[in-house]
């Protein structure tokens, strides 16, 4: 999917509101020097095409996350906000059915959030030219 | 915890330079924006810029572009301002400051760095 | 630039007291209003991000709230540490601009 068209400050406002409290809540109790953000982002679209996959594919080690709360609030976004992005995903929805585990928080899951916190604030505050 | 530590007070003649240091712990240094704010005697508040510590992207105040450049050191996870051609409108109180968890606000403040310039 | 205007330079409250900081943006800010409380020894901090939403750790008396191009944040039960100056910040538009602070005095 591509986001170009998605209106990101009605994002930005979802993300401030809710997203990011549901995100706190899901660390609370981790180390904030526990991970280095790897994964980053250079623009908005780019920001959201990093955050649909860390949010909603399931990786080794972590194949939960997008049965939380923040990550049923992104998606909530996403349709609401990007045109045609609900379409998109019926087929991946239906394929996640069928392979839904059990919540397990893992030490890869936490990781897994500590990054996408990071690409969220990039979403946020998209504004660095490099020197 | 979070801490931002800034380098001491500076006396400095007009026309020269000075490079204050802010070091950060209790946090990775290179997944928060670095802001700068300057405090003149008994007045407000004035954002100068950002730098992103893990790229070394900046973006600044207008006002400030041609004072002011920022650095940023992994290694020793300090963040560096330099202040060029100095003159008395720069005599402030220089603060360093880390963006919030969510991006929004300056969350974590250094205790500020006083920079006199005179004669 | 956006202009942030804070009308009270400074305001007296009795301990106990609730009190009422306004802040005001010279166009909308879309709600991206930050308040922050400066002590005298000069140590600043976030208080409140997006309007309203309380930073970690500060107490549950401080309250915010406005849309558009009025803010204002409110201290329910005022308290011998809350004496500061309290500025308010847009983060809607660069560059970000700040309120002109308001000191805050016990009667």
């Known amino acids: 999917y591509d986001f170009t068209n998605c209106d990101f400050e009605k994002i930005k406002a979802a993300y401030l509101s809710t997203i990011s409290k549901d995100l706190i809540t899901y660390m609370s109790g981790t180390k904030s020097t526990e991970f280095n953000n790897t994964v980053s982002c250079s623009n908005r679209p780019h920001c959201l095409t990093e955050i649909q996959s860390l949010t909603f594919n399931p990786t080794a080690g972590c194949a939960s996350l997008a049965k939380e709360m923040f990550a049923m609030k992104t998606k909530a976004a996403l349709a609401i906000w990007c045109p045609g992005y609900s379409e998109t995903q019926i087929n991946a929805t239906q394929a996640m059915k069928k392979r839904r585990k059990r919540k397990v928080t893992t030490n890869k899951c936490l990781e897994q959030v500590s990054q996408l916190q990071g690409l969220w604030r990039r979403f946020n505050r998209p504004l660095l030219k490099q020197q | 915890q979070v801490q931002l530590q800034q380098s001491g007070a500076e006396l400095v003649r007009p026309g020269t330079s000075v490079k204050v240091s802010c070091k950060a712990s209790?946090?990775?240094?290179?997944?928060?924006?670095i802001d700068w704010v300057k405090q003149r005697p008994g007045q407000g508040l004035e954002w100068i810029g950002v730098?992103?510590?893990?790229?070394?992207?900046?973006n600044f105040n207008e006002k400030f572009k041609g004072k002011a450049t920022l650095t940023a050191d992994k290694s020793s996870s300090t963040a560096y301002m330099q202040l060029s051609s100095l003159t008395s409108e720069d005599s402030a109180v220089y603060f360093c400051?880390?963006?919030?968890?969510?991006?929004?606000?300056?969350?974590?403040w250094g205790q500020g760095t006083l920079v006199t310039v005179s004669a | 630039d956006i202009q942030m205007t804070q009308t009270s330079s400074s305001l007296s409250a009795s301990l106990g007291d609730r009190v009422t900081i306004s802040c005001r943006a010279s166009?909308?800010?879309?709600?991206?209003l930050n308040w922050y409380q400066q002590k005298p020894d000069g140590t600043v901090k976030l208080l409140i991000y997006?309007?309203?939403t309380l930073h970690s750790g500060v107490p549950s008396r401080f309250s915010g709230s406005g849309s558009g191009t009025d803010y204002s944040l409110t201290i329910s039960n005022l308290e011998q540490e809350d004496i500061a100056t309290y500025f308010c910040?847009?983060?809607?538009?660069?560059?970000?601009?700040f309120g002109g602070g308001t000191k805050l005095e016990i009667k």
């Open positions: 400051a880390r963006e919030s968890e969510v991006g929004e606000g300056f969350a974590y």
């Open positions: 209790g946090y990775a240094f290179t997944n928060y924006f």
């Open positions: 730098i992103n510590p893990g790229s070394g992207g900046t």
């Open positions: 166009q909308d800010i879309s709600n991206y």
């Open positions: 997006y309007t309203s």
């Open positions: 910040q847009q983060g809607n538009t660069l560059p970000y601009t």
